[in-house]
């Protein structure tokens, strides 16, 4: 059966998953969804890793942890009730039916006050060819539920030396958690 | 608007206890990592401690078996429990929001406190 | 002993440009993590003046800019101003520590 979280009408909701990398420079691909997990990859994704870096997400949809050390926990910026339903967390484990899955119940509740616009987190981006216009001094700040679907293809390299994480300490959050290796 | 404000400093003495509090607003701890550094009178900063996300905590080395950090998500804050202080714990303490990007791309920006003093002295 | 390597000091004549280097290792800059600088004066809390490598909060001038390549970051002061006198400190993460990493920090002195 699925985990349970829960989060307010326009407040930011996170569902944890984490894992441990095997040996060092070791991340394995990740992918989020809407929706159970299927038997294969993630249906309706809305964010994904690789073994270097997140290479893919879709607005409202973040990583705010330590992804390279396994901490995969995503967040939802600005929920509405719509966000409401399962979510799949898929620690993509190479070799045939390897892959850990974990199904996490999100559950929307009505703000108990009617929040005011206030914007919670700032995404700000420093490609200019992507969101903003050259020469016009800083990039601009943006929320995340502005920003149109990304897919990075070309992003900065992790070196081989990574060390062992020491990420899988005793969560208090009895989020998803596995260890690799 | 995102406010980290720290509370609880003041003067103690050696093997003494003492406890910070970090009240944020405009974020939720839950699902952030906050951190406490430290500078020491005319140094550097240094890393003290984090909870991440989920409430996993982390510590320096020079804190461990000594400091605990938590969170209450009700209030919204974070705490530092310092036990059996030295001399050397003498620093301010700042509370702070820390944040991961990739490649240049962040879900926010780091922010601190104004911090707040703690003397070890005897 | 700081974990990221920042020279002591630096100096330069009001207008001129100066940089400032932040050298990592591959286990921090050079594993992917981004790096953010502070400016620090004399009995304040640190100011955030660049955040991942390049991007400048709302109300920094635009004569900082920062920048990372490999496993070392740059913050560079173009047009120095009398009030740039203060220390710098570049922070990142590393693989090593779920926690943050510190430059030593960079005194800079205009002339």
């Known amino acids: 059966s699925e985990v349970e979280y829960r989060a307010e009408v326009g407040q930011n909701a996170y569902l944890p998953c984490f894992y441990t990398p095997a040996a060092p420079g070791n991340l394995v691909p990740v992918c989020w969804g809407k929706g159970a997990c299927p038997v294969f990859e993630c249906g309706n994704v809305v964010l994904r890793t690789d073994e270097r870096d997140v290479n893919y997400w879709t607005s409202r949809y973040w990583l705010n942890g330590d992804f390279r050390k396994g901490d995969v926990s995503l967040t939802i910026e600005n929920v509405t009730l719509a966000d409401s339903g399962i979510y799949c967390c898929r620690i993509q484990i190479p070799g045939i039916m390897n892959d850990e899955k974990f199904n996490l119940k999100l559950v929307i509740k009505p703000a108990k006050v009617t929040p005011a616009p206030t914007r919670q987190r700032d995404f700000t981006a420093a490609f200019p060819r992507m969101l903003t216009t050259r020469g016009h001094g800083p990039a601009e700040t943006q929320t995340l539920g502005s920003l149109p679907d990304i897919n990075l293809t070309q992003i900065s390299t992790l070196a081989n030396e990574l060390r062992d994480s020491r990420l899988a300490n005793d969560l208090r959050d009895s989020g998803a958690t596995i260890r690799i290796g | 608007e995102v406010q980290l404000v720290e509370s609880g400093g003041g003067l103690i003495q050696p093997g003494e206890s003492l406890r910070l509090s970090c009240a944020v607003s405009?974020?939720?701890?839950?699902?952030?990592?906050v951190a406490w550094v430290r500078q020491a009178p005319g140094k550097g900063l240094e890393w003290v401690a984090t909870?991440?996300?989920?409430?996993?905590?982390y510590y320096a080395d020079s804190v461990k078996g000594r400091f605990t950090i938590s969170r209450d998500d009700s209030k919204n804050t974070v705490d530092l429990q310092m036990n059996i202080l030295r001399v050397e714990d003498t620093a301010i303490y700042y509370c702070?929001?820390?944040?991961?990007?990739?490649?240049?791309?962040?879900?926010?920006?780091?922010?601190w406190g104004q911090g707040t003093t703690v003397t070890v002295s005897s | 002993q700081a974990v990221l390597t920042q020279p002591p000091s630096v100096s330069g004549a009001p207008g001129q440009r100066v940089t400032i280097s932040c050298t990592g290792s591959?286990?921090?800059?050079?594993?992917?993590?981004?790096v953010h600088w502070y400016q620090q004066l004399p009995g304040t809390a640190p100011k955030l003046l660049i955040y991942g490598n390049s991007n400048r909060p709302s109300g920094v001038p635009d004569r900082f800019s920062g920048s990372k390549s490999g496993t070392s970051a740059s913050l560079a002061i173009t047009g120095l101003q009398a009030e740039d006198e203060a220390v710098y400190f570049c922070q990142s993460h590393d693989t090593s520590v779920t926690g943050v990493v510190f430059g030593g920090g960079t005194k800079v002195t205009v002339l």
């Open positions: 702070a929001r820390d944040t991961y990007c990739t490649a240049g791309i962040c879900p926010s920006s780091p922010v």
């Open positions: 909870i991440n996300g989920g409430g996993s905590p």
């Open positions: 591959s286990s921090n800059i050079g594993a992917g993590y981004d």
């Open positions: 405009g974020f939720t701890v839950r699902g952030n990592y």
